[in-house]
Amino acid sequence: ITRQSLDPQRRAAPQQKRSSPTEGLCPPGHHISEDSRECISCKYGQDYSTHWNDFLFCLRCTKCDSGEVEVNSCTTTRNTVCQCEEGTFREEDSPEICRKCRTGCPRGMVKVKDCTPWSDIECVHKESGTKHTGEVPAVEKTVTTSPGTPASPCS
């Protein structure tokens, strides 16, 4: 850990940027020391802080789960960005798991949008053009294919 001190007597190592808390805060990529006198740098690839802060530690980098791909690696100022693998997507209401995209649309419907890491395929009725989410209204008794089943958990 690089400690950046208020003490002017301490010599900085070559190429080491020195900083001390500014109005009680440390810059992105750092956290404050327990005595609030120093800004301590986060460890690259291990932890991070994204904004000016007085955190007592840097936050741990996220590790992408199986079923996810790493889009951006963790830096001292930015967390890892993980994305669902091809053929799976993350729903807003259950962001912890990547769900399998449906492979096709029910009879009488056409696909208007492909599967993305953020959304399932989108189907519309051929005639009316109304959307179909894969959920069957309670009054309908027709047999339909079930929506995608969860892939491996994302956390």
């Epitope: 009680g24 327990e34 609030s36 007085d54 955190f55 007592l56 530690f57 936050l59 741990r60 956390s155």
Partner: nanobody, 126 residues
Framework: EVQLVESGGGLVQPGGSLRLSCAAS?????RYWMYWVRQAPGKGLEW???????????YYRDSVRGRFTISRDNFKNTLYLQMNSLKSEDTAVYYC???????????????????GAQGTQVTVSS
């Protein structure tokens, strides 16, 4: 009503071990970060350890890292602190606390102990 009840403290010799527990009720335990803080005689509150809501990320102050282990059971609504290789400087009243996010210097500095809070006394002495 939010309730946090600490237990497990006691008198132990240097080098000994204790396991503290904190039973939580009155809030959705699994949604909150949890901390252990302590207050030594005549001193202010000092942050000891923190754990995120899911329990996957744990953090420690330098003086306890490698000796203390924080953990939580979100089904039992309980927070734990396993304390090994105890030293005389660990003597304090230990409290658990809930929070929306990771601890900050300003948050710990302005933290106060509720009048009804008991804490659990840890005394390390030979």
């Amino acid at each position: 009503e939010v309730q946090l009840v600490e237990s497990g403290g006691g008198l132990v010799q240097p080098g000994g071990s204790l396991r503290l527990s904190c039973a939580a009720s009155g809030f959705t335990f699994s949604r909150y970060w949890m901390y252990w803080v302590r207050q030594a005689p005549g001193k202010g509150l000092e942050w000891v350890s923190a754990i995120n809501s899911g329990g996957g990320d744990t953090y420690y102050r330098d003086s306890v890292r490698g000796r203390f282990t924080i953990s939580r059971d979100n089904f039992k609504n309980t927070l734990y602190l396993q304390m090994n290789s105890l030293k005389s400087e660990d003597t304090a009243v230990y409290y658990c606390a809930k929070a929306e996010g990771p601890p900050t210097f300003s948050l710990i500095r302005t933290m106060t102990v509720d009048p009804g809070a008991q804490g659990t006394q840890v005394t390390v002495s030979s």
